[in-house]
């Protein structure tokens, strides 16, 4: 239950988050599970612990193994396990299945492909994007923040997309790549079980206390006119309107789009002046039609400009 699979490529940066959460956490200690040997916190080491994060800068195949993190507080110590596998770089263009992140499905307009795990890294825009190893060029492709936007998606856009970015740690740069498949559905006028494109299931969105935050729930329902299709947000299983928090409102984003027939809906959840208590809420993106309901859950976590735990742990 408190174990998480992580993978990366040799000579690239890999950052892994402890799968256990503190309630609260005072310090996080990391160990090599096999030897019980403590992982150093000094940044001069190639592999070092930095609070909730374990950093491989860069990773080596020999780093593969299970790592234990213990989130410590006066009340309870909570243990998690990170199962890390580092693979050799492939000489050819093929990205094997074991290096692939979850597949995403596209809608016809402004299709977004999120770069997996990027939130863990200290990176600066723009991202580089590749499809089947070819650098993406042309006005249809736009690298925006942590995702790729493809305008007027066509069946030919299906394939494996790789994002490449640079992680900076104390002035040193490390390359990171991550690949996921993108599928496009192109059947004639039909309705299918909702496909949520964003957010990813169990996504953790970092927010700053006191600032505004937006969460987009984006789902596709098939092709052609849909008899019934809706996307909405719920807070702790309650409709936004019934929850009674005026700071948190939802508004419809991009409506149904039909130029290639794919019917998709967006709903944006706007949180004004993010407060501590917002971090404790469960945010559910719900997509429903006649086939049924699909739910993706998002949690908010505090984005610290400077994380005490990272410095002192």
């Amino acid at each position: 239950k408190f174990s998480k699979q992580s993978w990366g490529l040799e000579n690239e940066a890999l950052i892994v988050r402890c799968p256990r959460q503190g309630k609260p956490s005072y310090t996080v200690d990391w160990y090599y599970s096999q030897t019980n040997k403590s992982i150093p916190t000094q940044e001069r080491n190639r592999v070092f612990a930095s609070g909730q994060l374990l950093k491989f800068l860069p990773a080596a195949v020999a780093d593969s193994g299970i790592y234990t993190c213990i989130v410590r507080s006066p009340t309870f110590n909570r243990t998690g396990y990170a199962n890390v596998t580092i693979y050799k770089k492939q000489s050819d263009c093929n990205v094997p299945d074991y290096l692939m992140y979850s597949t995403v499905s596209g809608s016809e307009k402004n299709s977004k492909i999120y770069c997996p795990t990027i939130d863990l890294y200290n990176w600066t825009a723009p991202l580089e994007w590749f499809k089947n190893c070819q650098a993406l060029q042309g006005s249809r492709y736009r690298a925006h923040k942590s995702f790729l936007v493809i305008d007027n998606v066509m069946t030919e856009d299906a394939g494996d997309y790789t994002c490449k970015f640079i992680h900076n740690e104390n002035g040193a740069n490390y390359s990171v790549t991550a690949t996921r498949s993108f599928t496009v559905k192109d059947e004639q006028g039909f309705s299918l079980f909702p496909v949520i494109g964003a957010p990813a299931q169990n996504e953790i969105k970092e927010v700053e206390i006191g600032k505004n935050a937006n969460l987009t729930c984006s789902a596709c329902f098939g092709k052609g006119t849909q008899f019934l299709a809706a996307v909405l947000w719920q807070l702790n299983g309650t409709k936004i309107t019934d929850f009674g928090e005026p700071r948190i409102q939802q508004e419809e984003g991009q409506n149904q789009s039909f130029s290639n027939g794919l019917a998709c809906l967006d709903m944006v959840l706007r949180i004004a002046d993010v407060k501590e208590e917002d971090l404790l809420l469960q945010y559910d993106c719900l997509a429903l039609n006649l086939h049924g309901l699909r739910r993706h859950t998002v949690r908010l976590s505090r984005k610290n400009p400077i994380d005490h735990h990272s410095i002192y742990c």
């Epitope: 959460q21 503190g22 309630k23 609260p24 956490s25 005072y26 310090t27 006066p74 009340t75 309870f76 909570r78 702790n236 501590e276 208590e277 971090l279 404790l280 809420l281 469960q282 976590s301 505090r302 005490h308 735990h309 410095i311 002192y312 742990c313």
Partner: antibody
């Protein structure tokens, strides 16, 4: 918004036991520890103990070991505290209080008044 | 156990002026992670305590910035820059450095 709704006032006889409850809403119950605090005019605020609803693990102030027993029901998002072998010393207001990922005692229930009297 | 010491009453203050409330711990509340685990709570008459300050100097959500806190590892001061009528109540300091968590006996804010 986060709410901790505690059960109503209790009047019990010495030697009896009582269970106080605290129903959480407005957040994910298992993502927060639940703590219990006793308040009396003589001793002020005293920390009794805590439970992690996710695992059921508990920790107690030595002073209240054997006196208080903490439990949590995930299905109803309710934490409970049983107080046993009651004496007049146990007469107090008891608060449940929830933690966040950053600190303890972030949210407080309205308190339950316990009176032990024959 | 760590003992938290507070005076029972503050010096009486006039509305609109500043007030200071002191607290002392029997042991340094500075953790090895660099954080000082000192907290301030206000209990208004007939209400539950509410968090004002966490980790010595951080304002809790929804608390007006008239409140501030400072201190060393063992001596702490809560300041209210412009006292309002709604600030009346008992102010408690508490430590969350180690178990058992302990509270001060509380300082009652007196208005002239």
């Amino acid at each position: 918004q986060v709410q901790l709704q505690q059960s109503g006032p209790e009047l019990v006889r010495p030697g009896a036991s009582v269970t106080l409850s605290c129903k959480a809403s407005g957040y994910i119950f298992i993502d927060s520890e639940m703590h219990w605090v006793k308040q009396t005019p003589v001793h002020g605020l005293e920390w009794i103990g805590a439970i992690d609803p996710e695992t059921g693990d508990t920790v107690y102030n030595q002073k209240f070991k054997g006196k208080a027993t903490l439990t949590a029901d995930k299905s109803s998002s309710t934490a409970s505290m049983e107080l046993s072998s009651l004496t007049s010393e146990d007469s107090a207001v008891y608060y449940c209080t929830g933690s966040t990922t950053d600190y303890y005692f972030a949210y407080w229930g309205q308190g339950t008044t316990l009176t032990v009297s024959s | 156990d760590i003992v938290m010491t507070q005076a029972a009453f503050s010096n009486p203050v006039t509305l609109g002026t500043s007030a200071s409330i002191s607290c002392r711990s029997s042991k340094s509340l500075l953790h090895s992670n660099g954080i000082i685990y000192l907290y301030w709570y206000l209990q208004k008459p007939g209400q539950s305590p509410q968090l004002l300050i966490y980790q010595m100097s951080n304002l809790a959500s929804g608390v007006p910035d008239r409140f501030s806190s400072s201190g060393s590892g063992t001596d702490f001061t809560l300041r209210i820059s412009r006292v309002e009528a709604e600030d009346v109540g008992v102010y408690y300091c508490a430590q969350n450095l180690e178990l058992p968590f302990t509270f001060g006996s509380g300082t009652k804010l007196e208005i002239k």
